[in-house]
Amino acid sequence: IFKKEQAMCLEKIQRANELMGFNDSSPGCPGMWDNITCWKPAHVGEMVLVSCPELFRIFNPDQVWETETIGESDFGDSNSLDLSDMGVVSRNCTEDGWSEPFPHYFDACGFDEYESET
């Protein structure tokens, strides 16, 4: 399951890179699979929010990103994820790359990477 999620993630990152015009030399943070969930590419200064993954969900490869990005002028709409919700994890895209997730998965979602690998 997790190998499949990882493969789907890489596909989604590829599509997002094309949509956003990202390449290897672009400033910002590359999309990544962190062994728990999928993070879309982001520009420096953006905060990306993801919902806690359902551990054994089967991904639809054609699904849209389940993340919302908050930039300077994009605060999302009423359907957006909100850091004030429970079960939401954020990472900031900084000049040094991705920040650590906040909250950490174990505290936000009740599980951590060791479980995802079993």
Epitope: L83, D85, M86, G87, P103, D107, A108, G110, T118
Partner: antibody, heavy 123, light 107 residues
Framework: QVQLQQSGPGLVKPSQTLSLTCAIS??????????WNWIRQSPSRGLEWLGR?????????HYAVSVKSRITINPDTSKSQFSLQLNSVTPEDTAVYYC?????????????WGQGTLVTVSS | DIQMTQSPSSLSASVGDRITITCRAS??????LSWYQQKPGKAPKLLIF???RLQSGIPSRFSGSGSGTDFTLTINSLQPEDFATYFC?????????FGPGTKVDIK
């Protein structure tokens, strides 16, 4: 019914090691759904979370930075218990020490506690 | 570390009163908050988790509310067994931290 029974000395000399044990009944220290925590309480510091251990295919510990260099929490699967060791104690470590089970339902919370052990650090 | 504060530090009330205790976090914690009751010489007892969810076996006169940085524990129709000290605790990031407590005594 989950019960946590604490044991260990109530008096420890400065610079020595504080050792307490928490025996679990009604659950298992190897449960994939729980965490096993130590908390202490003193008039000066109030309630202070010290750390936890848990099993999710392998053992993992999280410790409070304030005690990270001195603390060890170890599970004992054969006896379904877990222990606290706090090295190089000083009188500031005098407190009531509690073990507690952490459970998850939207957030981690401490739903069962041991009876508490007053540990005095004094020569 | 996230700092938790509570107000008031103590309050006097009578049986049947409705009381509210406030807890404030030094940064937003969504609803990753629990409330505990402690009586002298005893361990804390879980009342509320996830900001507002009542722990099994806890009377419905206890309720929690709030999100972000400000939270409230309400006890409707205070009972004799409710005179105790109440603590909030954040669970969004370690080290988990507790409020200093609110002591509820008999007026």
């Amino acid at each position: 019914q989950v019960q946590l029974q604490q044991s260990g000395p109530g008096l420890v000399k400065p610079s020595q090691t504080l050792s307490l044990t928490c025996a679990i009944s009604g659950d298992s220290v190897s449960s994939r759904y729980a965490t096993w925590n130590w908390i202490r309480q003193s008039p000066s510091r109030g309630l202070e979370w010290l750390g936890r251990t848990y099993y999710r295919g392998q053992w993992k510990n999280h410790y409070a930075v304030s005690v990270k260099s001195r603390i060890t929490i170890n599970p004992d699967t054969s006896k379904s218990q877990f222990s606290l060791q706090l090295n190089s104690v000083t009188p500031e470590d005098t407190a009531v020490y509690y073990c507690a089970r952490g459970m998850w339902n939207q957030n981690w919370f401490l739903d069962h506690w041991g009876q508490g052990t007053l540990v005095t650090v004094s020569s | 570390d996230i700092q938790m504060t509570q107000s008031p530090s103590s309050l006097s009330a009578s049986v049947g009163d409705r009381i509210t205790i406030t807890c404030r976090a030094s940064q937003p914690i969504s609803r990753y908050l629990s409330w505990y009751q402690q009586k002298p010489g005893k361990a804390p007892k879980l009342l509320i988790f996830a900001g507002q969810r009542l722990q099994s076996g806890i009377p419905s006169r206890f309720s929690g509310s709030g999100s972000g940085t400000d939270f409230t524990l309400t006890i409707n129709s205070l009972q004799p067994e409710d005179f105790a000290t109440y603590f909030c605790q954040q669970a969004i990031s370690i080290p988990y931290t507790f409020g200093p407590g609110t002591k509820v005594d008999i007026k």
